[in-house]
């Protein structure tokens, strides 16, 4: 899905009203030094592309993800705020409910959240405006 | 806890330079902008400008784009602020300041100060 | 750029009195909802400190006496009963549009 087309603003609003708590409550009782932010992102768009992997794709170590409330309201927002993004999802939505585990918070998912705070940080203050 | 320490006081001449660090200790680094304010004697905070240390993207304030420039060494966890051309008025001290954990672009952590005095 | 208005320069009161301290904009700093406007506290030979956030959060570790209010141009700040560690200098700052702008601060002062 290309994410240039996103009502950014709104999406951060979003991010900032709520995803953001979510993320803490998950992360609660870990040190932010524990981690080391390596994921980055370059634009809006390209942070969005990367948040959306590392919030819904499994990876090794972390499967759970995507039932997470943080989660589920990241899908809300992009469904809401970028045009034609749910008809893209529905695939993926059905693939997933195949696979789905049993929630486990392990340690390679709270890196996998740190390093997703790091990329909305950057997707809500990128220093260049025509990002 | 997130600590940011400046370097100590600097006295400089008319023209010439002047470079300002900051040494970020605790915390992540590479994902915070940071930013730099100075405040000149008896007055209000200036902003002159932002550096994200994990591409090293810089954003200035227009009045210091010609003068100031900002850097990182990733790899000291340190940001440096260096302005050219000093001119009497740039006498101030010059803080660092981390941007916030969300990206809602307030100032949670600020260094102690650096007091920088151009005089001939 | 966006400037930022504070008023009064300076205002002197007594400990245990009520404090309002306004910050103008000259364009709204609200953005989807959100009012992008930070305040600040700062005492001589001191970093400022964080106070309130986007008009009305409570910065980390601030006591419940400074609340904060307003959107679009207009927002205030009030200290609802002085303590005598309150006398300091106040800075408004938005971030809605670049480049950032702080406003020329108000004095609290002891009467």
């Known amino acids: 899905y290309d994410f240039t087309n996103c009502d950014f603003e709104k999406i951060k609003a979003a991010y900032l009203s709520t995803i953001s708590k979510d993320l803490i409550t998950y992360m609660s009782g870990t040190k932010s030094t524990e981690f080391n932010n390596t994921v980055s992102c370059s634009n809006r768009p390209h942070c969005l592309t990367e948040i959306q992997s590392l919030t819904f794709n499994p990876t090794a170590g972390c499967a759970s993800l995507a039932k997470e409330m943080f989660a589920m309201k990241t899908k809300a927002a992009l469904a809401i705020w970028c045009p034609g993004y749910s008809e893209t999802q529905i695939n993926a939505t059905q693939a997933m409910k195949k696979r789905r585990k049993r929630k486990v918070t392990t340690n390679k998912c709270l890196e996998q959240v740190s390093q997703l705070q790091g990329l909305w940080r950057r997707f809500n203050r990128p220093l260049l405006k025509q990002q | 806890e997130v600590q940011l320490v400046q370097s100590g006081a600097e006295v400089k001449k008319p023209g010439s330079s002047v470079k300002v660090s900051c040494k970020a200790s605790?915390?992540?680094?590479?994902?915070?902008?940071m930013h730099w304010v100075r405040q000149a004697p008896g007055q209000g905070l200036e902003w002159i400008g932002a550096i994200y240390p994990g591409n090293g993207e810089t954003s200035y304030n227009q009045k210091f784009k010609d003068r100031a420039t900002l850097t990182v060494d990733k790899s000291t966890r340190t940001a440096y602020m260096e302005l050219s051309s000093l001119r009497s008025e740039d006498t101030a001290v010059y803080y660092c300041?981390?941007?916030?954990?969300?990206?809602?672009?307030?100032?949670?952590?600020w260094g102690q100060g650096t007091t920088v005095t151009v005089s001939s | 750029d966006i400037v930022l208005t504070q008023s009064p320069a300076t205002l002197s009161l007594s400990p245990g009195e009520r404090a309002t301290l306004s910050c103008r904009a000259s364009?709204?700093?609200?953005?989807?909802?959100?009012?992008?406007m930070h305040w600040y506290q700062q005492k001589p030979g001191q970093p400022p400190r964080l106070l309130l956030y986007r008009a009305s959060n409570l910065g980390s570790g601030i006591p419940a006496r400074f609340s904060g209010s307003g959107s679009g141009t207009d927002f205030t700040l009030t200290i609802s009963s002085l303590e005598p560690e309150d006398f300091a200098v106040y800075y408004c700052?938005?971030?809605?549009?670049?480049?950032?702008?702080f406003g020329q601060g108000t004095k609290l002062e002891i009467k």
């Open positions: 300041a981390r941007e916030d954990d969300y990206g809602e672009g307030y100032f949670d952590v």
């Open positions: 605790g915390g992540t680094f590479s994902t915070y902008n």
């Open positions: 364009e709204s700093v609200d953005n989807s909802g959100l009012s992008f």
């Open positions: 700052q938005q971030i809605n549009t670049d480049p950032l702008t």
